[in-house]
């Protein structure tokens, strides 16, 4: 009689995570009598996966009925495979005894697990940045196997090239993670822009996973200010408007100053949205010129999104307007309707930055 051989016909088996793995093993003889055991790994630290003789192995089932006469097929199925199950599995024949002793091992079957990467998570900078600045975005995806993976960055569908990617760990592992950092230059038109991280892996069958970040969470577009004097409503009243244009996000507070003294503060509420996602807002001030003997310096001061204030001033010439008798108080009002620019031009075109 020829000596028993343990045949593991598959050198390697690849299984998708969550599926079952079938590991084939046959013996060539009924002799010697004794059980089959399956191990992961070799040597003293090997892990018992299945023991025909005894033990409870809830994930393992025998492919054939091992109690049936002349059975020589000791293939097993392992259910619900995870990346942690990867390794080399050995089918080992034992010889009956007290205790049973190892008789012969198969050559082993390497089980590799194909695990899908997790949905990429894209995160941007902690603080907002303004156009022309470069900001970094990170993309992370975990738990995939095998190690080979492709990551691409896009901004509004255009592929980016300025990024660095690492796959960890460098050595062998049951599963891997990818981390990538991309640099993006912001423009004033980026409120509606998206940054996309795209991950392609063998497990995804050509349908890559995408993670997105909206640049609206990252960008800050500072407003431009224009202060104009509108046509006179009444002989002693002047309407001055402050146009706040192209700002994002909406959080904005406006303060009117008359000769450096706070006249009124208000918060942007009824704004209009531009096509590019930025906002416009207008505030106006009715000034009773009869209450002023000298020229009035009107300043529109805007604090946008917690940043240092930006201001624009307009010099109101009192001499140009006759004073109305019997009135010595300044009448003020506000409005939020956008109006056309006045024929009057600003005397001061400069932005005044007040640092807090």
């Amino acid at each position: 009689e020829e000596e028993l051989q343990v045949i593991q016909p598959d050198k390697s088996v690849s299984v998708a995570a969550g599926e079952s793995a079938i590991l084939h093993c046959t013996v060539t003889s009924l002799i010697p009598v004794g059980p089959i055991q399956w191990f992961r790994g070799a040597g003293p630290a090997r892990e018992l996966i299945y023991n025909q003789k005894e033990g409870h192995f809830p994930r393992v089932t025998t492919v054939s009925e091992s109690t049936k006469r002349e059975n020589m097929d000791f293939s097993i199925s392992i259910s619900n495979i995870t990346p942690a199950d990867a390794g080399t599995y050995y089918c080992v024949k034992f010889r009956k005894g007290s205790p049973d002793t190892e008789f012969k091992s198969g050559a082993g079957t390497e089980l590799s697990v194909r695990a899908k990467p997790s949905a990429p998570v894209v995160s941007g900078p902690a603080a907002r940045a303004t156009p022309q600045h470069t900001v970094s975005f990170t993309c992370e995806s975990h738990g995939f196997s095998p190690r080979d993976i492709t990551l691409k960055w896009f901004k509004n569908g255009n592929e980016l090239s300025d990024f660095q990617t690492n796959v960890d760990p460098v050595g062998e592992s049951v599963s891997y993670s990818i981390h990538s950092t991309a640099k993006v230059v912001l423009t004033r038109e980026d409120v509606h822009s998206q940054v996309i991280c795209e991950v392609a892996h063998v497990t995804l069958q050509g349908d890559p996973l995408r993670g997105t970040a909206n640049l609206s969470e990252t960008i800050r577009v500072p407003p431009t200010l224009e202060v104009t004097q509108q046509p006179v409503r009444a002989e002693n009243q002047v309407n001055v408007t402050c146009q706040v244009r192209k700002f994002y996000p909406q959080r904005l507070q406006l303060t009117w100053l008359e000769n450096g003294n706070v006249s009124r503060t208000e918060t942007a509420s009824t704004v209009t949205e531009n096509k590019d996602g930025t906002y416009n807002w207008m505030s106006w001030l009715l000034v009773n010129v009869s209450a002023h003997r000298d020229d009035v310096k009107l300043t529109c001061q805007v604090e946008h999104d917690g940043q240092p204030a930006v201001s624009k001033s307009h010099d109101l010439k009192v001499s140009a307007h006759p004073k109305e008798q019997g009135s010595n108080t300044a009448a003020e009002n506000t409005g939020s309707n956008e109006r056309g620019s006045s024929d009057y031009k600003d005397d001061d075109d400069k932005h005044h930055h007040h640092h807090h």
Epitope: L30, E54, T67, E70
Partner: antibody
Amino acid sequence: QVQLVQSGAEVKKPGASVKVSCKASGYTFTNYWINWVRQAPGQGLEWIAMIDPSDSETHYNQIFKDRATLTTDTSTSTAYMELRSLRSDDTAVYYCAMDYGSLYAMDYWGRGTLVTVSS
Amino acid sequence: DIVLTQSPDSLAVSLGERATINCRASKSVSSSGYNYIFWYQQKPGQPPKLLIYLASNLDSGVPDRFSGSGSGTDFTLTISSLQAEDVAVYYCQHSRELPTFGQGTKLEIK
């Protein structure tokens, strides 16, 4: 190690039934056949039947087919052999034995249960 | 059914001498290249103990003075040098079909 522990001796009257138990330990009960064999005093071995605890497949010696019933309780790893319509010539030691190689052989034996049938 | 006939029914052999027990099947017990014959030893008051499986393979823990041979219908159990502890009744069993036992051979010391 493999152990098969059988129930105690029984004395029965002719026409009665007996149910002998065999509790297995030291191995996975559902992975190996259990055989039942009897031996009358001073006589040889006589095979009664066998059962596969994994699916309750049974094979009976034609002589015992109508009177013997094998069952198992996998929750307690116990095999049972019931013999009905007892006669005096059923007096014997009844053994359970485990087939370790699926060769329909008897590798490990219980110590036996003496069943005495007497009026 | 396959009938197994053992010979002799009883045997007396001197210590250290060879003992030979025969088992003949009423038809072949061979299948798939294996001979489905098993030999058991039973001492008084004890259950039988498996000695030889598939005609010629020594079970674990069995002294190598025991051996089995034969094929088809004729099989032999041999004890090469009889020891006092070998006094027992020996049975052959087949499993080519449903199992049956031979009638047994009683081995004594001469």
